[in-house]
Interface confidence: medium
């Protein structure tokens, strides 16, 4: 399996945005790569977002996706927005080299994203 590296822990900012780098050791000459972010919480795994991109081009997520990203070589810079405290969990980066053959797939160990809801501002008279 292809090796995928990602940071162990990331803290979302006060606006509920978290960014991390997902890096893969490409054993092939991929022209087309698919990146999927999975969230694992309470032994449940759900897909957060996914994008297929051509090497050297931008990642394109669906319009309503909470993810954005850029790619540079074998690195993908992922940003997840709109996070709240309840979204705290392990976010796993899955990378697939879709084309040309051979197909390779790798899954990272996951990035624990901590989200702290901001304290409501006290009313000021």
């Amino acid at each position: 399996a292809m090796h995928v590296a990602q940071p162990a822990v990331v803290l979302a900012n006060s606006r509920g945005t978290a960014s991390f780098v997902c890096e893969y050791a490409s054993p092939g000459k991929a022209t087309e790569v698919r990146v999927t972010v999975l969230r694992q919480a309470d032994s449940q795994v759900t897909e957060v977002c996914a994008a297929t991109y051509m090497m050297g081009n931008e990642l394109t997520f669906l319009d309503d996706s909470i993810c954005t990203g850029t790619s540079s070589g074998n690195q993908v810079n992922l940003t997840i927005q709109g996070l709240r405290a309840m979204d705290t969990g392990l976010y796993i980066c899955k990378v697939e080299l879709m084309y040309p053959p051979p197909y390779y797939m790798g899954i990272g160990n996951g990035t624990q994203i901590y989200v702290i809801d901001p304290e409501p501002c006290p009313d000021s008279d």
Epitope: T31, E32, M98, Y99, P102
Partner: antibody
């Protein structure tokens, strides 16, 4: 059940054009890369062209580069091969074939083929 | 001239074991790409017989087996039967040509 049905073959004069279609069913078309493979009468198999599932990556055999164009319409589950500047040596049965993604790729499923004859 | 080299013909009598070889190069089989085998019965489309060097799709009898070593691969058919009479092709991806390459095909004749 996976089904691939080629159409568009026929007799064409040298220098002419033809567009082949391959209608796919029984699988999620956009998830699979597709290929055209041809077989001249009494000869072996020759890979012609390939296109990735998204349509973003295309590859061609040197013998057809610059003359043939592979494309796909994922909304119609259809693969195409636009053949221009046809030559007598392009005469063959043209098969569309589906790649299989599972640790490696291979040409897992084939259509029954459509015959292209280039002759004056 | 095919990129992968196969013998043009092979033959055997019913019950015998026959082997068909497929020789490639450092840009295809030798580069680590898997070898796949196809059977083409007269007048029909090719059918996947062996994938990833030695794997059989469901429905293919275990009389058919494949192996790969270095830049070569082989297909073995044991307990030969008359219905095995067909053309057999090997295939692999080639990373210098960026495409699939095939052997020239081996015509198998079942004698008697």
């Amino acid at each position: 059940e996976v089904q691939l049905l080629e159409s568009g073959g026929g007799l064409v004069q040298p220098g002419g054009s033809l567009r082949l279609s391959c209608a796919a069913s029984g699988f999620t078309f956009s998830s699979y890369s597709m290929n055209w493979v041809r077989q001249a009468p009494g000869k072996g198999l020759e890979w012609v062209s390939a296109i990735s599932g998204s349509g973003g990556s295309t590859y061609y055999a040197d013998s057809v580069k610059g003359r043939f164009t592979i494309s796909r319409d994922n909304s119609k589950n259809t693969l195409y091969l636009q053949m221009n500047s046809l030559r007598a040596e392009d005469t063959a049965v043209y098969y569309c074939a589906r790649d299989r993604v599972e640790m490696n790729q291979w040409l897992a499923d084939w259509g029954q083929g459509t015959l292209v004859t280039v002759s004056s | 001239q095919s990129v992968l080299t196969q013998p043009p013909s092979a033959s055997g009598t019913p019950g015998q074991r026959v082997t068909i070889s497929c020789t490639g190069s450092s840009s295809n089989i030798g580069a680590g790409y898997d070898v796949h085998w196809y059977q083409q019965l007269p007048g029909t489309a090719p059918k996947l017989l062996i994938y990833r060097n030695n794997q059989r799709p469901s429905g293919v009898p275990d009389r058919f087996s494949g192996s790969k070593s270095g830049t070569s691969a082989s297909l073995a058919i044991s307990g030969l039967r008359s219905e095995d009479e067909a053309d057999y092709y090997c295939a692999a991806w080639d990373d210098s040509l960026n495409g699939w390459v095939f052997g020239g095909g081996t015509k198998l004749t079942v004698l008697g």
